[in-house]
C-alpha cells in the first residue's frame, strides 16, 4: 500500500528513459583505495561505531560490508599496522540475537571467526590478522566502501 | 599523522589525473525524487533512527540533511499526509548538549523550530507541517538523500 508521494515518485521515475541512471563509480575518488570492485576509505581519526556509520553515510558510502573470507583477507592485507582496529558494518542485533550487517542480512557463521562476545552493544572491528567484537562505544578507526562497478538501472529496494 | 596505508593511498591517487573523479549523479535513480540538487528516497517501511541511518548508508546515501528553512519547506511540500513522520539526519548529542547533524555540524537554532524535548535518545523527524523530537527507538519512515550535481575532484575530508 503506497502513499501518494511514493506512487508519484514511481510514476515520475518510470516515465523516464531508464538508461539514464547513475553511471556508477568509474574510478575511486581521491584518497580512496580500489580493492576489486570497491573503493575503500580508511579513516585517519577515531569514532564510536555509530558515528563511523554516520560518517560513511554522509560520504554517500557504507561501512564496509564483507562478502566472504576471501574479501576479508584481501582487506586485511591493506592494513599495515597489526595493532590498529577498524570498524566494519556489522553489529549485534539484540532482538534477533545474531550478528547483523547494516544491509539487514545476517552473518554466515563460516565467513568470519569473531573473537569476543556476541552480546548487546557489540560491534565488529577488523585488524590485520583478526576479527574482534568490541563495545560499540569504543573509539577506533573505520572503513567506508563505495561500489565501483558502473551499474545501469540500479534499483534500491526499500529495506 | 597518516598510517603507511593512507600515505600509500594518497600517493596512488595523486599520481592520477584528478579529472577522472566520480562523475556525480547525473539524474536520480529509479524511485528517487529530484528536489533541486538532491535525489530523495522516501521509505515505504518503518525503522528506528539508527536502522534508518544504516539503510541510507547501504544505499550509498545519507539520511536527509537540511540546509535551511527553505529546503525544509520544499521537502515538506512532498509529504502528502499530515500525520506521517520521517526521520532525518539530526539527533541529540548528549556529550555536546546540542542537536547535531550526522555530518558533524550543529543545528543553527534559527533553521528548524523543533517541537519536543532536546534530551538523550532524541532524534528528529519531519512531517508535512512540523519538525518533531522523538525517541530514536520510534519506528517511523525515513528520507535518504544523494547529491545530484556532478562534482569534479570531490574530496571527502575525514571527519
Amino acid at each position: 500500500q503506497k502513499s501518494s508521494i511514493e506512487k508519484c515518485s514511481v510514476d515520475i521515475q518510470q516515465s523516464r528513459n531508464k538508461t539514464t541512471e547513475r553511471p556508477g563509480l568509474l574510478n575511486c575518488p581521491i584518497y580512496w583505495q580500489q580493492l576489486r570492485e570497491k573503493c575503500l576509505l580508511f579513516s585517519h581519526t577515531v569514532n564510536p561505531w555509530n558515528n563511523s556509520l554516520a560518517d560513511c553515510s554522509t560520504k554517500e558510502s557504507s561501512l564496509l560490508l564483507i562478502r566472504d573470507k576471501d574479501e576479508l583477507i584481501h582487506t586485511q592485507n591493506l592494513i599495515r599496522d597489526k595493532a590498529i582496529l577498524f570498524w566494519i558494518g556489522l553489529n549485534f542485533s539484540l532482538s534477533e540475537k545474531n550478528w547483523k550487517w547494516i544491509n539487514g542480512s545476517f552473518l554466515n557463521s563460516n565467513d568470519l571467526e569473531i573473537r569476543g562476545d556476541a552480546k548487546e552493544n557489540s560491534c565488529i572491528s577488523i585488524s590485520q590478522t583478526s576479527v574482534y567484537s568490541e563495545y560499540c562505544s569504543t573509539e577506533i578507526r573505520w572503513i567506508c566502501q563505495k561500489e565501483l562497478t558502473p551499474v545501469r538501472n540500479k534499483v534500491y529496494p526499500d529495506s | 599523522q597518516k598510517s603507511s596505508i593512507e600515505k600509500c593511498s594518497v600517493d596512488i591517487q595523486q599520481s592520477r589525473n584528478k579529472t577522472t573523479e566520480r562523475p556525480g549523479l547525473l539524474n536520480c535513480p529509479i524511485y528517487w525524487q529530484q528536489l533541486r540538487e538532491k535525489c530523495l528516497l522516501f521509505s515505504h517501511t518503518v525503522n528506528p533512527w539508527n536502522n534508518s541511518l544504516a539503510d541510507c548508508s547501504t544505499k550509498e546515501s545519507s539520511l536527509l540533511l537540511i540546509r535551511d528553512k527553505d529546503e525544509l519547506i520544499h521537502t515538506q511540500n512532498l509529504i502528502r499526509d499530515k500525520a506521517i513522520l520521517f526521520w532525518i539526519g539530526l539527533n541529540f548529542s548528549l556529550s555536546e548538549k546540542n542537536w547535531k547533524w550526522i555530518n558533524g555540524s550543529f543545528l543553527n537554532s534559527n533553521d528548524l523550530e523543533i517541537r519536543g524535548d532536546a534530551k538523550e535518545n532524541s532524534c528528529i523527524s519531519i512531517s508535512q507541517t512540523s519538525v518533531y523530537s522523538e525517541y530514536c527507538s520510534t519506528e517511523i519512515r525515513w528520507i535518504c538523500q544523494k547529491e545530484l550535481t556532478p562534482v569534479r575532484n570531490k574530496v571527502y575530508p575525514d571527519s
Epitope: S95 | T138, E139
Partner: antibody
Framework: QVQLVESGGGLVKPGGSLRLSCAAS????????MSWIRQAPGKGLEWVSY????????AYADSVKGRFTISRDNAKNSLYLQMNSLRAEDTAVYYC???????????????WGRGTLVTVSS | DIQLTQSPSSVSASVGDRVTITCRAS??????LAWYQQKPGKAPKLLIY???ELQSGVPSRFSGSGSGTDFTLTISSLQPEDFATYYC??????????FGGGTKVEIK
C-alpha cells in the same frame, strides 16, 4: 481483505489467566504499531498496551502493568495479550487495533477488530 | 496523565442539523488528537486524525479543528447513519493514550 480478528476471550475466575490472539490479514503487519484497547460494558474506551513494529518497544496502561504482557509474531501476522492475575474490573470487550503507519508512538487507531469479550467473575 | 473532557455528553439533533462536539485536554497536545465514531455492538471507526485530517473513506461532512487544548468535531449536515457515540483521543507520543468520555448523538 484488510482485517483483524480477535480470539481467546471467555469467562475466567478472579486471579485466573487468559491469552488473547489477534490475526491480521490484508496488510504488511510488520510495518505497524499494534495495540489492545478495551471497553467495559456500557463504558468508554481504555487503551491497554502497544507494541512497536519490530516488537522492541512496548508500553502498558498503569491499570494492567505487571499483569498483562503484549507480544507479536510478525511471521504469523499475529498479536497476543497474555492476561494474568485477572480482576473483576478487567471485564470488557478487548479490541485489537492497528495504528496509522509511520505516525510513530502518536497512535491513531485506523483499523479495529470486532472484539472479544473477557468476563472475570467468580 | 492527560485527561480529555468531552461536551456535551449527549446531544439530540435532527437530520440535516449542524452538530458540534468539543474536546478539551488537561494540558497542551499540539495537534495530536483523533475522533472516532462508535455504533452499538460495533468497533470504533476513525474519522479524523491529527486534529483536522479526514481519514480515507470518511464523508466530507465530518471535519475537525483546534490545537493545543481545545478541539472541535463538526458534522455539517447530520445524516441518519451518523447517530452514534463519538470519542476524542489524544495521541501524544507518551502513553497512556486517553479517550474522552464520549458524546452520544441521538435523534430528536
Amino acid at each position: 481483505q484488510v482485517q483483524l480478528v480477535e480470539s481467546g476471550g471467555g469467562l475466567v475466575k478472579p486471579g485466573g489467566s487468559l491469552r488473547l490472539s489477534c490475526a491480521a490479514s490484508g496488510f504488511t503487519f510488520a510495518n505497524y504499531y499494534m495495540s489492545w484497547i478495551r471497553q467495559a460494558p456500557g463504558k468508554g474506551l481504555e487503551w491497554v498496551s502497544y507494541i512497536s513494529p519490530s516488537g522492541a518497544t512496548i508500553a502498558y496502561a498503569d491499570s494492567v502493568k505487571g499483569r498483562f504482557t503484549i507480544s507479536r509474531d510478525n511471521a504469523k501476522n499475529s498479536l497476543y495479550l497474555q492476561m494474568n492475575s485477572l480482576r473483576a474490573e478487567d471485564t470488557a470487550v478487548y479490541y485489537c487495533a492497528r495504528s496509522l503507519m509511520a505516525t510513530g508512538t502518536h497512535l491513531y487507531f485506523d483499523l479495529w477488530g470486532r472484539g472479544t469479550l473477557v468476563t472475570v467473575s467468580s | 496523565d492527560i485527561q480529555l473532557t468531552q461536551s456535551p455528553s449527549s446531544v439530540s439533533a435532527s437530520v440535516g442539523d449542524r452538530v458540534t462536539i468539543t474536546c478539551r485536554a488537561s494540558s497542551g497536545i499540539s495537534s495530536w488528537l483523533a475522533w472516532y465514531q462508535q455504533k452499538p455492538g460495533k468497533a470504533p471507526k476513525l474519522l479524523i486524525y491529527a486534529a483536522s485530517e479526514l481519514q480515507s473513506g470518511v464523508p466530507s461532512r465530518f471535519s475537525g479543528s483546534g490545537s493545543g487544548t481545545d478541539f472541535t468535531l463538526t458534522i455539517s449536515s447530520l445524516q441518519p447513519e451518523d447517530f452514534a457515540t463519538y470519542y476524542c483521543q489524544q495521541a501524544t507520543s507518551f502513553p497512556p493514550y486517553t479517550f474522552g468520555g464520549g458524546t452520544k448523538v441521538e435523534i430528536k
